[in-house]
Interface confidence: medium
């Protein structure tokens, strides 16, 4: 008779995680009589998966009755497959001995396990940035197999191109992870914007997984400041307003200074939202002109979202306000719109007029 051959007809088998796998193996001869063993991997470190004669293999059963003398089918059935079961399985014929003597191995069947990627998790920058700056968003998904996967980034439905993606590990593994970092340039209108990370994989049957992040968590829109004087009131009081506009987030503290001395401090709260997601706030200060001999320098000082304070000053000319009622008013606006577009070190603006 011809020399025994061990035939594993399938070079590869692909199974979804949780399903069962059948690994086929037949021998061409009953001789020599001796057990079949199944191993995952080859060489000295190979892992015993099933022994026809010994051991307890709760997830593995032989397809046919391998104790039968005439049996030539040594296929096995592995239940409840997980990604950890992936690998190349070898059906190996042994001749009885102490220990049994390996006679011949099959060519191997590669078992690949199709495992779904986890829901993508998108994380944004640790600190907020202002418009025109570039921020990075990271998307991570884990536990998928096979390795081939597609990841796309979108901002408000528009596909992004500035991103880098890595799938790890580079070599063979039971399952893989993907990590992608996208660079997004912020604009003032991005408070309501969203970035989406979309992952497509063979296990998802064309229905990709998505992870999202709101740019509202990453953006800071610094306020515009404008200080104006309202019409002179009858009781020698000047109403000065500080309009703080188009800022985000809402966290803002406003301080009025009269000639450098703190007059009042207020915290913004429960402000109505603009269409673009920003906020406006107006603060009033009543200045009693008759109480002052000299001109009064009013400063509206705004500290937004923990950033260095921004000042806007306004001079009320006391000399232009005779003590009698109905006199003309004159005021000098000495402030400028100061925006913190610059880096932190450049944000301290203190104008003294």
């Amino acid at each position: 008779e011809e020399e025994l051959q061990v035939i594993q007809p399938e070079k590869s088998v692909s199974v979804a995680a949780g399903d069962s796998a059948t690994l086929n193996c037949t021998v061409t001869s009953l001789i020599p009589v001796g057990p079949i063993q199944w191993f995952r991997g080859a060489g000295p470190g190979r892992e015993l998966i099933y022994h026809q004669k010994e051991g307890h293999f709760p997830r593995v059963t032989s397809v046919s009755e391998s104790t039968k003398r005439n049996n030539m089918d040594f296929s096995i059935h592995i239940s409840n497959i997980t990604p950890a079961d992936a690998g190349t399985y070898y059906c190996v014929k042994f001749r009885k001995g102490s220990p049994d003597v390996e006679v011949k191995s099959g060519a191997g069947t590669e078992l690949s396990v199709r495992a779904k990627p986890s829901a993508p998790v998108v994380s944004g920058p640790a600190v907020r940035a202002t418009a025109e700056h570039t921020v990075s968003f990271t998307c991570e998904s884990h536990g998928f197999s096979p390795r081939d996967i597609t990841l796309k980034w979108f901002k408000n439905g528009n596909e992004l191109s500035d991103f880098q993606t890595n799938v790890d590990p580079a070599g063979k593994s039971v399952s893989y992870s993907i990590r992608s970092t996208a660079r997004v340039v912020l604009t003032r209108r991005d408070v309501h914007s969203q970035v989406i990370c979309e992952v497509a994989h063979v296990t998802l049957q064309g229905d990709p997984l998505r992870g999202t992040a709101n740019l509202s968590e990453a953006i800071r829109v610094p306020p515009f400041l404008e200080v104006t004087q309202q019409s002179m009131r009858a009781d020698n009081q000047v109403n000065v307003t500080c309009q703080v506009t188009k800022f985000y987030p809402q966290r803002l503290q406003l301080t009025w200074l009269e000639n450098g001395n703190v007059s009042r401090t207020e915290m913004a709260s429960a402000l109505p939202e603009n269409k673009d997601g920003t906020y406006n706030w107006t603060s009033w200060l009543l200045v009693n002109v008759s109480a002052h001999r000299d001109d009064v320098k009013l400063t509206c000082q705004v500290e937004h979202d923990g950033q260095p304070a921004v000042n806007k000053s306004f001079s009320v000319k006391v000399s232009a306000h005779p003590k009698e009622q109905g006199s003309n008013t004159a005021a000098e606006n000495t402030g400028t719109n100061e925006r913190d577009y610059k880096d932190d070190d450049d944000k301290h603006h203190h104008h003294h007029h």
């Epitope: 001789i31 010994e54 009755e65 009885k96």
Partner: antibody
Framework: QVQLVQSGAEVKKPGASVKVSCKAS????????INWVRQAPGQGLEWIAM????????HYNQIFKDRATLTTDTSTSTAYMELRSLRSDDTAVYYC????????????WGRGTLVTVSS | DIVLTQSPDSLAVSLGERATINCRAS??????????IFWYQQKPGQPPKLLIY???NLDSGVPDRFSGSGSGTDFTLTISSLQAEDVAVYYC????????FGQGTKLEIK
């Protein structure tokens, strides 16, 4: 390690039956054939029969086919050999032996059970 | 059924000398290079012990002074240098069909 522990000696009258047990340990009982072999005093080895505990498939020596019955209890990993219609020439040591590699050979042996048939 | 005939029935060999026991099958028990002959050693009061399987393969723990050879119908068990503990009865067995044993060969020291 593989161990086959057999029941104790029996004395039987002609025409009676005897049931010898063989308790296996140290391996997966249902994965190996169990053989039964006897040896009359001062005589050679005589194969009686074999059983596959996984499904109770049996093969008998034609000489014993009508009188011997092999059974197993997989819950206790025990094999049994019953011999009926005993005669004086059935006096022998009865061995159970395990076939490791489906070679129809006997790799591991019990210590034997002496069955004496005497009137 | 296959009949196995051992020769001689008994054998006396001096310590350190070679002992040879033969086993002839009534039909071939060989195929594709594998020979379905097994050799057992039985000492008084003990069960048999497998020495050699598939005609020429030493079972684990068996001293290498024991060897088996042969093919087809004629097989030989050889002890290259007899030791005192080798005194026993030796049996051949075939498994080409259902098992049968040879009648045994008693080995003694001369």
């Amino acid at each position: 390690q593989v161990q086959l522990v057999q029941s104790g000696a029996e004395v039987k009258k002609p025409g009676a039956s005897v049931k010898v047990s063989c308790k296996a340990s140290g391996y997966t009982f249902t994965n190996y054939w169990i053989n039964w072999v006897r040896q009359a005093p001062g005589q050679g080895l005589e194969w009686i029969a074999m059983i596959d505990p996984s499904d109770s498939e049996t093969h008998y020596n034609q000489i014993f086919k009508d009188r011997a019955t092999l059974t197993t209890d997989t819950s206790t990993s025990t094999a049994y050999m019953e011999l009926r219609s005993l005669r004086s020439d059935d006096t022998a040591v009865y061995y159970c032996a395990m076939d490791y590699g489906s070679l129809y050979a006997m790799d591991y042996w019990g210590r034997g059970t002496l069955v004496t048939v005497s009137s | 059924d296959i009949v196995l005939t051992q020769s001689p029935d008994s054998l006396a060999v001096s310590l350190g000398e070679r002992a040879t026991i033969n086993c002839r099958a009534s039909k071939s028990v060989s195929s594709s290079g594998y020979n379905y002959i097994f050799w057992y050693q039985q000492k008084p009061g003990q069960p048999p012990k497998l020495l050699i399987y598939l005609a020429s393969n030493l079972d684990s723990g068996v001293p290498d002074r024991f060897s088996g050879s042969g093919s087809g119908t004629d097989f030989t068990l050889t002890i290259s240098s007899l030791q005192a503990e080798d005194v026993a009865v030796y049996y051949c067995q075939e498994s080409w069909e259902l098992p049968t044993f040879g009648q045994g060969t008693k080995l003694e020291i001369k």
